[in-house]
């Protein structure tokens, strides 16, 4: 970036620069016409009558340097070709010299500082590249010369620029005094202030833009070069804060819009709010869960909000004596989570309607809670009791929800107790074709034995068609139509009002080979 200290092209009033000496043929301020056809203030000198060695000086007004260490002077000028001037002496020149003088204030006068090199500091002798020529019978042709000189290092408050002519026929069309500075820059979310280079390269500390935070130490820096350009290098060290994303080619951190969020420091973009969450404000680092939806403590901020599952469905039970198996289907709504478990609660309800938690002798397999499969086996049920089992589905956010989890209840009433198994069978008589059996009356817990069922079959013939049954109301039975000398396996069960009890152990009996032994009393 160039910062102008003086540009005569922009001056509308007379420049009124100082000339020396006050004599004929001196530099003269004239109106000129620039490339854009605008009227400009110019200075011209063309003293072909001057005595040899006589210099014409022209000095600008005092120019404050405004912190610049090196100032550049771009001079646009025209120069007459000595050869085109018929009356030009041998002292005709096609060059001029540029000087500067530093001071702390505008203290120069028409006579001071002395018009010579030292105190004036010589910058350069400038030669024209293009000369204005005139050939007989033709118009004069010329071209503007442009020369940029470097002044400095400067240290005082300001300076004057001076031009020394020693025999040229020339015009200064414009003078542009400027210094170079690195303009403020934002790159990779880092702001570097406008900097005037004081040396070849100057390190400049950067600061993070609004809503960006440092991510590295030391703070990011960039080098401002003497030519007013920032050195090409990668700048790192700032990233957008949570709730903000980089925008406009990494120049600003822009607040995440409504409905979006960014959870951490970094270069990531804002993301749409996960399912079942929202951000009503801009600049959100997290999206809030909708009513009825939650995030578990272990869920990342970027995860969707979830809800407890609905109740399990279709609970079925299989009662076998004092053992119950409950099975169910998964809930219709999982709540959007994978960590689904089940819990079973048991209550024992009296005919009057009062319910109490089930007793401690009941066992659950694999357990009453944290069930991952949709079943449980329950042992230790008492007979003739109505149980209410409540099966609930749970997930990682169930504990965050208000109110109890929804459950699916099932009522199970156990049977009254059946008679115990009949054992201790005796053969009281046997013949080649019959057996008379008897047994002890079992102690039935729920009322008297109503009758018995005898199940028997020949040993070795165990198919369903070979098994025979016999009902008897007494604790004895006669089995007829048996094979001679054959072995039979016999089982008995008793029935009470609660139903049949289990068959007892198989009893081994054998028929006689001949009649002489028939009805022979045998003791079991």
């Amino acid at each position: 970036l160039e910062e102008t200290l003086l540009n005569t092209k922009l001056e509308t009033a007379d420049l009124k620069w100082v000339t020396y000496p006050q004599a004929e043929g001196q530099w003269e301020e004239l109106s000129g016409l620039d490339e854009e056809q605008h009227s400009v203030r110019t200075y011209e000198v063309c003293d072909m009558k001057r005595p040899g060695g006589q210099a014409h000086w022209l000095r600008t007004g005092w120019v404050p340097r405004r912190g610049a260490v090196h100032v550049y002077a771009t001079i646009r000028f025209t120069m007459m070709e000595c050869l085109s001037l018929p009356r030009a002496s041998r002292s005709c020149k096609e060059t001029f010299t540029v000087f500067y003088y530093e001071s702390e204030a505008d203290t120069a006068t028409a006579h001071t500082p002395a018009w010579m090199e030292n105190p004036y500091i010589k910058v350069d002798t400038v030669a024209a590249e293009h000369l204005t020529r005139k050939r007989p019978g033709a118009e004069a042709t010329g071209k503007v010369n442009i020369k940029t000189l470097r002044l400095g290092p400067l240290s005082k408050a300001g300076f004057y620029l001076a031009f020394q002519d020693q025999g040229a026929c020339m015009a200064l069309l414009s003078l542009h005094l400027f210094y170079k500075k690195c303009s403020w820059l934002i790159t990779n979310l880092t702001y570097f202030p406008e900097t005037v280079p004081r040396e070849l390269v100057v390190p400049v500390a950067g600061s993070c833009v609004a809503n960006a935070v440092p991510t590295a130490n030391p703070s990011p820096s960039l080098y401002c070069r003497e030519d007013g350009q920032w050195a090409e290098q990668q700048v790192t060290g700032c990233s957008c804060a949570p709730g903000y994303e980089a925008a406009e080619s990494n120049k600003v951190c822009r607040a995440c819009g409504q409905g979006t969020f960014k959870p951490q420091i970094g270069d990531e973009s804002c993301l749409p709010c996960p399912a079942n969450s929202h951000s009503n404000n801009i600049g959100s680092p997290v999206c809030l869960c909708r009513i009825g939806y939650y995030r578990a403590r272990s869920d990342p901020r970027s995860s969707p909000c979830t809800t407890p599952p609905s109740a399990p469905r279709s609970v079925v039970h299989h009662l076998n004596g004092s053992t119950l198996r409950l099975e169910w289907s998964a809930p219709l709504e999982s709540g959007g989570r994978e960590d689904l478990t089940y819990a079973v609660r048991c209550r024992e309800c009296r005919p009057g309607g009062s319910c109490l938690p089930c007793g401690g002798d009941m066992t659950f397999d694999p357990g009453p809670r944290d069930l991952v499969e949709p079943w449980v086996a329950i042992r230790g049920l008492r007979p003739d009791v109505t149980y209410t089992f409540e099966v609930a589905a749970l997930n990682g956010v169930s504990t965050l929800a208000t109110g109890p989890p929804p459950f699916e209840p099932v009522n199970v009433t156990t049977d009254r107790e059946v008679p115990p198994a009949v054992s201790d069978i005796r053969v009281t008589r046997s013949s080649p074709s019959s057996l008379i059996l008897s047994w002890a009356i079992p102690r039935a817990p729920s009322g008297a034995v109503l009758d018995y069922e005898v199940k028997y079959h020949e040993k070795g013939a165990e198919g369903p068609s070979s098994v025979r049954f016999l009902k008897t109301s007494e604790n004895r039975a006669e089995l007829r139509g048996l094979k001679r000398g054959a072995s039979y396996l016999v089982q008995v069960r008793a029935r009470s009002e609660a139903g049949y009890g289990p068959f007892g152990q198989e009893h081994h009996s054998q028929t006689q080979l001949d009649e002489s032994e028939s009805w022979r009393e045998q003791l079991a």
Epitope: Q37, T42, E44, M48, G142, A171
Partner: antibody, heavy 126, light 107 residues
Framework: QVQLVQSGAEVKKPGSSVKVSCKAS????????ISWVRQAPGQGLEWMGR????????NYAQKFQGRVTITADESTSTAYMELSSLRSEDTAVYYC???????????????????WGQGTLVTVSS | DIQMTQSPSSLSASVGDRVTITCRAS??????LNWYQQKPGKAPKLLIY???ILQSGVPSRFSGSGSGTDFTLTISSLQPEDFAVYYC?????????FGQGTKVEIK
Amino acid sequence: QVQLVQSGAEVKKPGSSVKVSCKASGGTFSTYAISWVRQAPGQGLEWMGRIIPIFGTANYAQKFQGRVTITADESTSTAYMELSSLRSEDTAVYYCARSSYTILTTYYNYNAMDNWGQGTLVTVSS
Amino acid sequence: DIQMTQSPSSLSASVGDRVTITCRASQNINNFLNWYQQKPGKAPKLLIYGSSILQSGVPSRFSGSGSGTDFTLTISSLQPEDFAVYYCHQVSDTSDTFGQGTKVEIK
């Protein structure tokens, strides 16, 4: 402001010559173009020629070639126009005019004339 | 020499009128064309140079346009002091030429 002051009116015989002067007051003279323009009674403007004093040589309109001579004296900042072989049709007001910009201070030399002398009436009559 | 033809040679107009004068060159002169105003008994006055550049101190109601061979001088709203003769002037060649002039009279 520069002033161009011309010499006084002249009455000339046909066949004779006339030399009109134009003195510039104040500042640079050598690098401006000085043109001579004439205007016959009730007629339009007619360009005769131009000189840039520093170069010494002049350009002339074809019509006046060989009959007109334009010169300049840098020491006195004066330009001259001499017309020979005068005829009655040369009766006119003769103006000197200076260009708006010097040859060195204009990017495009439009040779526009923004400073004019008061005019010199030359009457050619027998 | 390059010939310059002005039209019309004269025109009558009222104060406040928009007036247009044209000038045609016999060959391309780029934009090397100037316009002058002359009042009786006075030296000409430069109005416009370089086809369209208004000379310092000239009212902005005067404007010029054109390039190549066709040029126009326009007075947007004629004022009483604008009644005069107007000349175009080409400076493209080593030899300048003027147009024959256009007289602007009061209607």
